[in-house]
Interface confidence: medium
C-alpha cells in the first residue's frame, strides 16, 4: 500500500530545485530566488544561508544546494559548516578585548583558538612535575616524589599564577 501511494503521489516526481506547490494542484514549481531544495519530493524550499558580517561566501546558493560560508581574513571557522568565526591568535595566546595577548605565567593555551587555562597542579594528585609548563604547553606530571628512586630528581613546579585575567600587556 505504501508503495502504491508513493507512486500515486505527484509530489514524488518533483526533482531537486523544485517544490510541490499545493496552491497549484501539486505542480512542481521552481524554488523562488534565495531558496533551494537539495532532494526531490519537497513540499517547500529552504531559505538559502546568507554569509554576512564576519562570514563570507565560499559557494553561492543554487536552486539545488545551500550557500557555503567561510570567514573573512584574520578569522577561522569553528563548528560544522562554519557556524562560527573566531579571530586568529597563536598558541600561547588568548583573545581579549585588546586583541591577542600572551598567556600569563602559570597558564597555557596549546591551540590557535581559545583561552589560557591554568597549568595542572600535579601535587593535587600526589604527583611531581616531570616537565615544566610553558605558555603553549601544560606541565607534565610524573610519579609522586615518594616513588622516585634515591638520587633521582624532579623538576620543582613554580607556583601557578591563578590570574589568567591579568596577562602582561
Amino acid at each position: 500500500f505504501e508503495r502504491t501511494r508513493s507512486l500515486q503521489d505527484p509530489c514524488s516526481n518533483c526533482p531537486a530545485g523544485t517544490f510541490c506547490d499545493n496552491n497549484r494542484n501539486q505542480i512542481c514549481s521552481p524554488c523562488p530566488p534565495n531558496s533551494f531544495s537539495s532532494a526531490g519530493g519537497q513540499r517547500t524550499c529552504d531559505i538559502c544561508r546568507q554569509c554576512k558580517g564576519v562570514f563570507r561566501t565560499r559557494k553561492e546558493c543554487s536552486s539545488t544546494s545551500n550557500a557555503e560560508c567561510d570567514c573573512t581574513p584574520g578569522f577561522h571557522c569553528l563548528g560544522a559548516g562554519c557556524s562560527m568565526c573566531e579571530q586568529d591568535c597563536k598558541q600561547g595566546q588568548e583573545l581579549t578585548k585588546k586583541g591577542c595577548k600572551d598567556c600569563c605565567f602559570g597558564t597555557f593555551n596549546d591551540q590557535k583558538r581559545g583561552i589560557c587555562r591554568p597549568w595542572t597542579n600535579c601535587s593535587l594528585d600526589g604527583k611531581s612535575v616531570l616537565v615544566n609548563g610553558t605558555k603553549e604547553r601544560d606541565v607534565v606530571c610524573g610519579p609522586s616524589p615518594a616513588d622516585l628512586s634515591p638520587g633521582a630528581s624532579s623538576v620543582t613546579p613554580p607556583a601557578p599564577a591563578r590570574e589568567p585575567g591579568h596577562s602582561p600587556q
Epitope: M84, K97, Q111
Partner: antibody
C-alpha cells in the same frame, strides 16, 4: 547534526554519589573542550567544570572542587561527571556543553535532573 | 570570584528595541557572550566575541561593549524573543561566570 545526549540524572540521598554521562555525535569530539553547567530550579546558570581535548587539563568551580570529577573517553565520544558527597544544594538540571574555542558554549545537551533529598 | 550583574527583568513593546546590560570587572578585559533560554530548554548562544552571531541567529540580535559593561540589543523584538537572557564571561581565576539573568517580556 550535532547532538549531545545526556543520561544519569536521578534522585539521590545527601552524601550519595551519581555519575552523569554525555555522548556527543556530529562533531570531531576530541578537538574540543567540554563543560558541565548546572541550573538549580528557578536559579541562574552555574559553570561547574571543564576538561581539555585530551582530558589532561581539568578545572572546577569552588562549589564542587574535591567532590566532583570530570573525565572523558574520546574513543566513545563521551563525557562524564562523577559526583560524590552530594548535598541538597547540588539539586539542579545538569547540562553538558561543547566549546569550540573553550570560550563560548555552543552546543548544549538537553539537561538531566539531579535531585538530592532525604 | 567575579560577578556579572544584570537587571532581573525588562519589557519591550512588540516591534520595538530593547537593550539588556551586564556589568562586571572581568568585562574590562574579556568580551561577554550572550545566551537565550526558554522554559524547559537548554540555552542558545546568541552573541560571542566583539559582536559576532553564530550562523542562524537573526540579525535583530546584536552586541556591544564598553569598559565594564556588555550590552545585548534586540531591534524589532518579536513575540518569540520572550525568555531569559544570560551574559557570560571569565572570572579572575580563569573560570566562567554567568550573570543572574534578565527576563525579557514582549508586550
Amino acid at each position: 547534526e550535532v547532538q549531545l545526549v545526556q543520561s544519569g540524572g536521578d534522585l539521590v540521598r545527601p552524601g550519595g554519589s551519581l555519575r552523569l554521562s554525555c555522548t556527543v555525535s556530529g562533531l570531531p569530539y576530541s578537538d574540543y573542550y567540554m563543560h558541565w553547567i548546572r541550573q538549580a530550579p528557578g536559579k541562574k546558570l552555574e559553570w561547574i567544570s571543564d576538561i581539555g581535548p585530551r582530558g589532561t587539563s581539568v578545572h572546577y568551580a569552588d562549589s564542587v572542587k574535591g567532590r566532583f570529577t570530570v573525565s572523558r573517553d574520546n574513543t566513545k565520544n563521551s563525557l562524564y561527571l562523577q559526583m560524590n558527597n552530594l548535598r541538597a544544594d547540588d539539586t539542579a538540571v545538569y547540562y553538558c556543553a561543547n566549546a569550540f574555542s573553550s570560550s563560548w558554549f555552543y552546543n548544549w545537551g538537553r539537561g538531566t535532573l539531579v535531585t538530592v533529598s532525604s | 570570584s567575579s560577578e556579572l550583574t544584570q537587571d532581573p527583568a525588562v519589557s519591550v513593546a512588540l516591534g520595538q528595541t530593547v537593550r539588556i546590560t551586564c556589568q562586571g570587572d572581568s568585562l574590562r578585559r574579556y568580551y561577554a557572550s550572550w545566551y537565550q533560554q526558554k522554559p524547559g530548554q537548554a540555552p542558545i548562544l546568541l552573541i560571542y566575541g566583539k559582536d559576532l552571531r553564530p550562523s542562524g541567529i537573526p540579525d535583530r540580535f546584536s552586541g556591544s561593549s564598553s569598559e565594564n559593561t556588555a550590552s545585548l540589543t534586540v531591534t524589532g523584538a518579536q513575540a518569540e524573543d520572550e525568555g531569559e537572557y544570560y551574559c557570560n564571561s571569565r572570572d579572575s581565576s580563569g573560570n566562567w561566570v554567568f550573570g543572574g539573568g534578565t527576563q525579557l517580556t514582549v508586550l
